[in-house]
């Protein structure tokens, strides 16, 4: 299964299966959830180790096990990889580090005011994997402001060096926020010039395609088919670049198909796994398993959840049966792809779905009326969970934020529901950053079913929280998919990073924003909470969040919308939004419902028809 | 050019036999998945039947599962469709045509022959 | 088996028109859905493949879009040779079934 949790001050020994440089262990984990072998993972921070060649050291691990032998060393941050987490993977990596230098080829180098300008410029450049920027404090002052654009054979730096004034982030192509945009089409009988970066064995063209869009380096390809006159060259599918970032040339040729990386598509990236199941084909590679299984359908399964499996083959030979079940075939390779693909078999072979980010039909859980005063404007993709809860009478308006939580559940407040408890009059739009751009052919979600807390009362704050259940489930995107709840009473963990976001008022008197508004947030004991309202009581059931000073809050129209806090590098939904005195009002910070403290509640009520409970763990 | 010409239909009486082939050429049959597609009067296509490029893998529809037999005999060229104990529900037009793996599509159709099943 | 929707069933258009048939899969397909041309009394012939990818051949006014459960054919400056009837068509999961189809009639 999925597991998420890191550990501290440990050190995962033997099973390397690479190693690199990466400027944290998320970036560490994100690259060994991508890698075809690996399953474990540790880092080791600048202040971990002396040895400067080790610094920001990423190694990648396997093992037959599925775990190694951990040894202390301090500061060391290791862990699994996010195969199997569903949602969780994403190559999408925004976090811009300060004091760093991520050294690599320095292929263009421009003057900007920011380092988000040049992050949007690496992110605009084609060959661009990763930056660096000297800010206006740099000690050389010629350098100051350099844009520099990189690239590597790895795609992830050479060298990282720590250095005062300059910040360094990754490209955010992989986050669908290429400004380039994509060339969908693929050709019939065109085979593309220039460098081979990589060769794998694929069954068609379109796995061909994905394994380019998710290579560091690959631009475009060539699939030369199951048909091609050479027979030792069938089914190859070659991984190229060019300087230009275009083929330089092509030629028409039979039995090839060509085309390009997705990886510069906007809003939208084919999901890095192979869904398709090939009749009559056969796919070669290690062994890992032999198990009868009915039907090849389940044989999918198998490898799925066979964390090591990387695709399989189902046989239908005679020999291979008895009564209803035949010989499931667990492979893997050491690129992924299968080191041999036969036709007119009786077989039938596909791949392990591990890295599919559609996840299963669940909530997201992990074991381990009111707008943002004083915030400023999110992005797209930055919360891609916040969705608004819109009313349609007469005219439409937005009226409530709620958290996507699984493919067909959202949590809200129950409070955005007084007056309101009519399912159909209800609009709820994902994925969306600028209420402005909602049109009459904006899809959106209709409520199958409104459930308000058996406990809430109308103009009471307690037990503020309400579920609903969508007519039809959504799928993932970059820019819509699911936060993951806290464990059942988490009181342990100390949030430090926490973020309230919506597009509610800016002021007390104010109005719906246009753009997603964020505000960090500190915490606030439930004692100086209810210090500062002493006429309320406030419940273990409820968190506070807000500055002694004020001046930053939820406010109306951010109701039911999340409070999220970041710990090891995933977020979590730890509040909805609920009420307080006015808004951003000095000593009246906000209070929202604590999750926690309904995760029994949650778990209950999100069990599907069958009983079967739709919370997913990824810990 | 590739060509797929069918062959062998006709009218035949409900619980009778027919054999349907179809001549392939312009291209490497031995190479290809192949496939019966049909048409009833007016209705829409109905995939009926794949074989994979050896004859090894064979696919049916419920419909006509334990009915029909696909084969194919690559020296010939060739593809079959057998059809046991018809129903007046099998009247169609049946195309043959031709699988391309590598872009997941059936890119060449014959013109298709007629069967029809009635007393 | 995987059941293809096709909408509208029929519609009526004029030379020169832009029309849109759409195509609903009943579990995600990924990319892997074709779409097809027939015209009357004649074998189908493939336009689309794979979702997006023109046939060789096939004039460019035609296009298709989309991924995983919903998908569109577009015929731009429609043309008196495209009154015909166009089937959707999966093929990622056996058997490879068809939609309906959707008849495009002179107005």
């Known amino acids: 299964g999925c597991l998420t949790q890191l550990y501290e001050n440990a050190f995962f020994r033997g099973g390397d299966v690479a190693s690199m440089y990466t400027p944290n262990a998320q970036y560490c984990q994100m690259r060994c959830t991508f890698h075809p072998r690996c399953l474990l993972f540790s880092f080791l921070p600048a202040s971990s180790i002396n040895d400067m060649e080790k610094r920001f050291g990423c190694f990648l691990k396997d093992s037959v096990t599925g775990t190694l032998p951990k040894v202390h060393r301090t500061g060391a941050v290791s862990g699994h990889s996010l195969k199997q987490c569903g949602h969780q993977i994403s190559a999408c990596h925004r976090d811009i580090y300060k004091g760093v230098d991520m050294r690599g080829v320095n292929f263009n180098v421009s003057k900007v005011s920011s380092v988000e300008e040049c992050q949007k410029r690496c992110t605009s450049n084609i060959r661009c994997q990763f930056f660096s920027y000297a800010t206006q404090t740099f000690h050389k002052a010629e350098y100051r402001n350099n844009c520099l654009l990189k690239y590597s054979p790895g795609g992830t730096p050479t060298a990282i060096k720590v250095l005062s004034n300059v910040e360094s982030g990754f490209s955010l192509k992989p986050c669908a926020l290429s400004e380039i945009g994509c060339h969908m089409n693929i050709f019939q009988h065109l085979a593309f010039s220039d460098v081979d970066v990589a060769r794998v064995l694929t069954p068609d063209a379109f796995v061909c395609r994905t394994i380019c869009t998710y290579h560091p380096n690959c631009l475009f390809f060539t699939f030369y088919t199951n048909v091609w006159k050479i027979e030792s060259q069938r089914n190859v599918c070659l991984l190229k670049t060019s300087e230009s970032g275009t083929p330089s040339s092509s030629t028409p040729q039979e039995n090839t198909i060509s085309g390009y990386s997705l990886l510069t598509c906007k809003r939208t990236l084919p999901e890095p796994c192979h869904s398709k199941i090939y009749p009559g084909v056969d796919f070669g590679g290690e062994e890992l398993n032999v198990t009868f299984v009915k039907g090849v359908n389940v044989c999918q399964e198998t490898c799925t959840k066979m964390i090591r499996c990387q695709f399989f083959t189902y046989s239908l030979l005679p020999e291979d049966c008895k009564e209803e079940k035949c010989k499931c075939f667990l492979r893997l390779s050491m690129d992924g792809s299968p080191t041999r693909i036969a036709y007119g078999t009786q077989g039938s072979s596909g791949y392990s779905l591990r890295l599919c980010n559609t996840g299963d039909n669940s909530v997201c859980t992990t074991k381990t009326s009111t707008r943002i005063v004083g915030g400023t404007n999110s992005s797209w993709g930055e919360w891609p969970w916040q969705v608004s809860l819109q009313v349609k009478l007469t005219a439409q308006r937005h009226l409530c934020g709620g958290s996507l939580i699984g493919h067909q559940w959202v949590l809200t407040a129950a409070h955005c529901f007084d007056g309101l408890p009519l399912q159909d009059v209800w609009r709820i739009y994902s994925g969306i950053l600028n209420l402005s751009d909602i049109t009459k052919d904006t899809p959106f979600s209709q409520i199958k079913e409104i459930i308000i807390h058996q406990n809430y009362k109308v103009s009471e704050g307690n037990h503020d929280i309400a579920l609903i259940k969508l007519q039809a489930p959504l799928n993932y995107t970059e820019f819509q998919k699911p936060i993951c709840l806290p464990s059942k009473g988490d009181t342990s963990t100390i949030y430090t990073n926490c973020w309230v976001t919506g597009w509610g008022f800016s002021k007390e008197k104010g109005e719906i924003q246009n753009i997603l508004q964020k505000v960090n947030i500190p915490l606030v004991t439930n004692e100086e909470c209810q210090k500062r309202y002493q006429d309320y009581k406030i419940t273990q059931r409820m968190v506070c969040a807000g500055y002694k000073e004020g001046g930053k809050d939820a406010c109306k129209g951010d109701s039911g919308g999340p409070l999220v806090c970041k710990h090891n590098g995933m977020w979590r939904l730890v509040g909805i939004t609920s009420w307080g005195e006015g808004c951003a009002r000095r000593e009246q910070p906000g209070v929202y419902t604590k999750v926690a403290e309904y995760m029994d509640w949650i778990l209950e009520k999100t069990q599907s028809s069958d009983g079967k409970a739709q919370m997913q763990s990824p810990a | 050019e590739v060509q797929l010409l069918e062959s062998g239909g006709g009218l035949v009486q409900p619980g009778g036999s027919l054999r349907l082939s179809c001549a392939a050429s312009?291209?490497?049959?031995?190479?290809?998945?192949m496939m019966w597609v049909r048409q009833a009067p007016g209705k829409g296509l109905e995939w009926v039947s794949s074989?994979?490029?050896?004859?090894?893998?064979?696919y049916y529809a419920d419909s006509v599962k334990g009915r029909f037999t696909i084969s194919r005999d690559n020296s010939k060229n060739t593809l079959y469709l057998q059809m046991n104990s018809l129903r007046a529900e099998d009247t169609a037009v049946y195309y043959c045509?031709?699988?391309?793996?590598?872009?997941?599509?059936?890119?060449?159709w014959g013109q298709g022959t007629l069967v029809t099943v009635s007393s | 088996d995987i059941q293809m929707i096709q909408s509208p069933s029929s519609l009526s258009a004029s030379v020169g028109d832009r029309v849109t048939i759409t195509c609903r899969a009943s579990?995600?397909?990924?990319?892997?859905l074709n779409w097809y041309q027939q015209r009357s009394g004649k074998a189908p012939k493939l336009l689309i493949f794979?979702?997006?990818n023109l046939q060789t051949g096939v004039p460019s006014r035609f296009s298709g879009s989309g991924s995983g459960t919903d998908f569109t054919l577009t015929i731009n400056n429609l043309q008196p040779e495209d009154f015909a009837t166009y089937y959707c068509?999966?093929?990622?999961?056996?058997?490879?079934?068809f939609g309906p189809g959707t008849k495009v009639d002179i107005k």
């Open positions: 045509a031709r699988d391309q793996v590598a872009a997941a599509a059936i890119d060449y």
């Open positions: 312009g291209f490497t049959f031995s190479e290809y998945d």
């Open positions: 074989i994979g490029s050896s004859g090894g893998m064979t």
């Open positions: 579990q995600s397909i990924s990319g892997y």
């Open positions: 794979a979702a997006s």
């Open positions: 068509q999966q093929s990622h999961t056996p058997p490879k079934t």
